[in-house]
Amino acid sequence: APTSSSTKKTQLQLEHLLLDLQMILNGINNYKNPKLTRMLTFKFYMPKKATELRHLQCLEEELKPLEEVLNLAQSKSFHLRDTKDLISNINVIVLELKGSETTLMCEYADETATIVEFLNRWITFCQSIISTLT
């Protein structure tokens, strides 16, 4: 059974992941930066089901495309800290959260998503899991 300390650690990792995803979304949704419409050509795959930590496998598989689109977006008006570093940090958190005991084949929904829809989906996932832990 999960201990209170492991639950607390999980919660903190989810909060860190949530903040990273929100930071990216805030940069993209910055209306001072409509240049970023070019990012809408990129297609992201959404999980058919995302209710448990193991479903983060679906996010992990989309991190490479996410890095590519963020590299395209980098400009004077949209500047994240080193993109590679950011994605690497997200990857580390995702790997720890989903665990490596069971390898899940991610099931994707039929409908694809833009980067905005994709980030919103995973932000909602983080918020939902955090609320069950608190």
Epitope: T37, M39, L40, F42, T114
Partner: antibody
Framework: EVQLVQSGAEVKKPGESLKISCKGS????????IGWVRQMSGKGLEWMGI????????RYSPSFQGQVTISADKSISTAYLQWSSLKASDTAMYYC??????????????WGQGTTVTVSS | SYELTQPPSVSVSPGQTARITCSGD??????AYWYQQKSGQAPVLVIY???KRPSGIPERFSGSSSGTMATLTISGAQVEDEADYYC???????????FGTGTKVTVL
Amino acid sequence: EVQLVQSGAEVKKPGESLKISCKGSGYNFTNYWIGWVRQMSGKGLEWMGIIYPGDSETRYSPSFQGQVTISADKSISTAYLQWSSLKASDTAMYYCARHGGGWSGWGMDVWGQGTTVTVSS
Amino acid sequence: SYELTQPPSVSVSPGQTARITCSGDALPRKYAYWYQQKSGQAPVLVIYEDSKRPSGIPERFSGSSSGTMATLTISGAQVEDEADYYCYSTDSSGNHYVFGTGTKVTVL
């Protein structure tokens, strides 16, 4: 009404220079990418390049890089396509188009009426 | 350079279904957009982001995408749908855009 109005038809000789224009109205011209598209007679559409009038960042098709220059003057809501030395093969219809955002994603939702360029000796 | 390949022509009887395909290596990760161009006119956006229809575009126009292939479907084709259709997308880098080779749709 959102629209793009292009300059009139041009007849030029090989080796001459040319600058055609595309004036936007009815929206914030600064905040939308503008693309240029070539269509030779009886042929398909060819993407030439895009410009973001807000800071004049441009992207060119490898096929048109070095052949044309795309520019914009946001103070008068106008984008330009220019040639320093025209060739007979530049004879075509040229369209400017606005890349959307919002409801049309990256789709080109507003098009100019087209400018016919004829290059002949 | 990146290419999007379409069939040169598609013929359909009025009321029947026309399907136009667009093939490109980057399409699993990049959205396709479809334009209709009638003779002597500027192109019009009929589908964006693979399957979304702009307001004012009839419901008979739909789009889908699977793997390296995007498809524009005209269900119950009308005589006024006779036009050239072009897909449009970007290469894998997202920096360069390209139109498909174009498909002439004839409604016989």
